[in-house]
Interface confidence: medium
């Protein structure tokens, strides 16, 4: 295993709530500098399982705006541009960590929260249940 | 914008780094109780743009292991189960927040970081560039 010596410059942990409540630097570092600037942006229209993006806003949350994908069709778009109901458009879901102000309306106190968001849609072969 | 009255019970914000450094309760709250129990889990095999999951590990990050989707094919799977190169499998990407220990190896001081992860793949019609 990797052995990690404790850093002698670590902050003090005498706080009675330690270690549940910690200091977090919100000066967010973005590791995405080399990524494609298009960021999948037109895929929602070009996909065989296209989706619409719906805005979800919550001022007590960081990030306050989250865009949610909703599949446009139950089926998938075929080569003729029609909906093929022998296939299914399904949302790809992902949990994300967000910060929620706690107590509410406090500018400098948060709680980590997991929420589930739909990022986009993909076209899948349906699971067919045969009735005896 | 929405104006939020300040809660009189908020923690003190005299810290010289305020508001960049905030208190965060890491006792993660899960808002996902009413969600679809399928966890999108078998879509990576059933999709017409299937993907594999690749492991990315970093012991100084939470979560330390992130499984990234990599599309299996350049094209998409057609009704015959063959790869159709007239369509493209593309990754759906999403930014997520992770926590990084800062300074390194300290158990109670963190920095938020945004990273881009590929969540799954979708099948899109290619953009065809016609050469004059």
């Amino acid at each position: 295993g990797i052995t990690i010596p404790r850093n002698p410059g670590c902050p003090n942990s005498e706080d009675k709530n330690f270690p549940r409540t910690v200091m977090v630097n919100l000066n967010i570092h973005n590791r995405n500098t080399n990524t494609n600037p298009k960021r999948s942006s037109d895929y929602y229209n070009r996909s065989t399982s296209p989706w619409n993006l719906h805005r979800n806003e919550d001022p007590e949350r960081y990030p306050s705006v989250i865009w949610e994908a909703k599949c446009r069709h139950l089926g998938c778009i075929n080569a003729d541009g029609n909906v093929d109901y022998h296939m299914n458009s399904v949302p790809i879901q992902q949990e994300i960590l967000v910060l929620r102000r706690e107590p509410p309306h406090c500018p400098n106190s948060f709680r980590l929260e997991k929420i589930l968001v739909s990022v986009g849609c993909t076209c899948v072969t349906p699971i067919v249940h045969h009735v005896a | 914008g929405i104006t939020i009255p300040r809660n009189p019970g908020c923690p003190n914000s005299e810290d010289k780094n305020f508001p960049r450094t905030v208190m965060v309760n890491l006792n993660i709250h899960n808002r996902n109780t009413n969600t679809n129990p399928k966890r999108s889990s078998d879509y990576y095999n059933r999709s017409t743009s299937p993907w594999n999951l690749h492991r990315n590990e970093d012991p100084e990050r939470y979560p330390s292991v992130i499984w990234e989707a990599k599309c299996r094919h350049l094209g998409c799977i057609n009704a015959d189960g063959n790869v159709d190169y007239h369509m493209n499998s593309v990754p759906i990407q999403q930014e997520i927040l992770v926590l990084r220990r800062e300074p390194p190896h300290c158990p109670n001081s963190f920095r938020l970081e945004k990273i881009l992860v590929s969540v799954g793949c979708t099948c899109v019609t290619p953009i065809v560039h016609h050469v004059a």
Partner: antibody
Framework: EVQLVQSGAEVKKPGSSVKISCKAS????????ISWVRQAPGQGLEWMGG????????DYAQKFQGRVTITADESTTTAYMELSGLTSDDTAVYYC???????????????????WGQGTTITVSS | EIVLTQSPDFQSVTPKGKVTITCRAS??????LHWYQQKPDQSPKLLIK???HSGSGVPSRFSGSGSGTDFTLTINGLEAEDAGTYYC?????????FGQGTKVDIK
């Protein structure tokens, strides 16, 4: 390959304490949870508590609160469980188990035990 | 705390037979239910995570299903090496809890 290797069996007197170690190898120790689960003879599994070295905190089952202390040393990739005020009811096999801390297929996956130690038998007898 | 109740407590099955074990949670836990196998004098081993996903190196004869409060572990084509005790487990909320176990033996 991930391995959790526990310290050896011990015989203890009632009222005394015991401290068991669990040495992890083959994975990034700090970012995984380590839980302790015990099994009395012929009985089922009982969760005692766990620690996430990354955050430095421990959680305990109410039944053991005040009697159990779980710690971890990242420099040696070892977790410890100390149980005090031992009685004959504490005679059991004690397991450490790793709780993954992964973002898997779109989910934060942190609530099951993917690897277990070999177990440490603690016998409490006068 | 969340109580997990397994049934049956004991099952005796012939080789190549089918085993079905159910686990009921006292409240909705989504799909946060896991199954472990414990052979005599061995540590438990993860079989199924998140109700239906196989653990590493688990044979395909083991499968899981269910969500909410009702879950099932199925062994199709029981082999002699499958004898042991099977436990369900939830980590949806603390404390972690386990079912009381189902002992499976081979006739």
């Amino acid at each position: 390959e991930v391995q959790l290797v526990q310290s050896g069996a011990e015989v203890k007197k009632p009222g005394s304490s015991v401290k068991i170690s669990c040495k992890a190898s083959g994975g990034s120790f700090g970012s995984y949870g380590i839980s302790w689960v015990r099994q009395a003879p012929g009985q089922g599994l009982e969760w005692m508590g766990g620690i996430t070295p990354f955050f430095g905190w421990a959680d305990y089952a109410q039944k053991f609160q005040g009697r159990v202390t779980i710690t971890a040393d990242e420099s040696t990739t070892t977790a410890y469980m100390e149980l005090s005020g031992l009685t004959s009811d504490d005679t059991a096999v004690y397991y450490c188990a790793r709780e993954p801390n992964e973002f898997w297929n779109g989910y934060y996956s942190t609530d099951h035990f993917d690897y277990w130690g070999q177990g440490t038998t603690i016998t409490v007898s006068s | 705390e969340i109580v997990l109740t397994q049934s049956p407590d004991f099952q005796s099955v012939t080789p190549k037979g089918k085993v079905t074990i159910t686990c009921r949670a006292s409240q909705d836990i989504g799909s946060e239910l896991h199954w472990y196998q414990q052979k005599p004098d061995q540590s438990p081993k993860l079989l199924i995570k998140y109700a239906s996903h196989s653990g590493s190196g688990v044979p395909s004869r083991f499968s899981g299903s269910g969500s909410g409060t009702d879950f099932t572990l199925t062994i199709n084509g029981l082999e002699a090496e499958d004898a042991g005790t099977y436990y369900c487990h939830q980590g949806f909320s603390l404390p972690h809890t386990f079912g009381q176990g189902t002992k499976v033996d081979i006739k």
